[in-house]
């Protein structure tokens, strides 16, 4: 994903997880100076920012998150222990600070580990 | 109904500048974003621009980055396009696009085109 | 970016017959961000179909949608004097949003 001032790339868009699981949203940018980069979460049951910053600067990690986010300079972000109602779309955008963005998209599936997956 | 009537389209010559507008109406224009879509003559579709429902998030295809800007005045329901050094490859019909919620169930990223004006020709030519 | 090719540029088919026509991604995209539409010659392009399968306000159901990864179909089942017309996929799930070159579906 390239425009004049930023390029994002996403490795992996789709991603599958069961409960309690640690999940890396892998991505990797470029751009002109230091960036604004920011996850949204998006699902059914409504959507909600979960994290903004610059990287090299403290997170401002939303109360909903707060605890279960982890961010990372490349601009990835890591949630720990997820669960089903994490499922959903996960958007990063990343903004320079000349204005120019871009934005990529990340769907999650968490499911319930069965018993019979055990066996 | 939802309706969308572009205006602003005309010869233009290279270099210069024009200002695209986008009335909208039938609908609650501030709860959706908005998108401009052009084709150049006997081409196909490509994408030029988005913004969201409240301005807040403006997205653009590499090949206008820096050149075009696009707004809204969601009190006069209107989408705009400022496109700036004009060149002939910008000759084309622009189109404004109505960006459904599809998948979102959210305005602030681009969903499908759901409805379009009729579209608004600029030429650029000496 | 995400390059859409679609295949084949032209489709030539009579009326009443089935049209299939591919749509093939240079990378992922999940379903929900996949989108056709029809254009007619001098006419504003419809949408027909959203999240790859999803049929759009008003559109008959002879139009179906189907695909994932990389590789999406759009499907007319029986085709209409009106269906003839060109159709592209665009996906909107990153940016920039892209579109297919478009398939043209006509007259045999």
């Known amino acids: 994903l390239q425009s004049q001032g930023v390029s994002l790339y996403i490795p992996q868009a789709t991603i599958n997880a069961t409960v309690k699981e640690d999940i890396l949203l892998s991505v990797e940018y470029s751009c002109h100076g230091v960036p604004t980069i920011e996850w949204t979460y998006s699902s059914n049951w409504g959507t909600q920012k979960i994290v903004e910053w610059k990287p090299g600067t403290q997170a401002n990690i939303s109360q909903s998150h707060k605890d279960r986010v982890c961010t990372f300079d490349n601009g990835s972000i890591q949630l720990f222990s997820v669960g089903v109602r994490d499922s959903g779309y996960y958007v990063i955008t990343v903004t320079e600070r000349l204005g120019s963005s871009q934005f990529g998209t990340i769907v999650l599936h968490v499911s319930e580990i069965l018993y019979e997956d055990l066996h | 109904q939802v309706q969308l009537v572009e205006s602003g389209g005309g010869v233009v010559q290279p270099g210069r500048s024009r200002r695209l507008s986008c009335a909208a109406s039938?609908?609650?224009?501030?709860?959706?974003?908005m998108h401009w879509v052009r084709q150049a003559p006997g081409k196909g579709l490509e994408w030029v621009a988005f913004i969201s429902q409240n301005g807040g998030k403006k997205y653009y295809a590499d090949s206008v980055t820096g050149r075009f800007t696009v707004s809204r005045d969601n009190s006069k329901n209107t989408l705009y396009l400022q496109i700036n050094s004009l060149t002939t490859d910008d000759t084309a019909v622009f189109y404004c696009a109505r960006s459904g919620s599809g998948s979102w169930g959210y305005s602030d990223f681009p969903g499908p085109f759901d409805h379009w004006g009729q579209g608004s020709l600029v030429t650029v030519s000496s | 970016e995400i390059v859409l090719t679609q295949s084949p540029g032209t489709l030539s088919l009579s009326p009443g017959e089935r049209a299939t026509l591919s749509c093939r991604a240079s990378q992922n995209i999940f379903i929900s961000f996949l989108a056709w539409y029809q254009q007619k010659p001098g006419q504003a392009p419809r949408l027909l179909l959203y999240?790859?399968?999803n049929r759009a306000t008003g559109i008959p159901d002879r139009f179906s949608g189907s695909g994932s990864g990389t590789d999406f179909t759009l499907t007319i089942s029986r085709l209409e004097p009106e269906d003839f017309a060109v159709y592209y996929c665009q996906q909107y799930g990153s940016s920039p949003l892209t579109f297919g070159g478009g398939t043209k579906v006509e007259i045999k």
């Open positions: 999240g790859a399968s």
């Open positions: 039938g609908f609650a224009f501030r709860n959706y974003g």
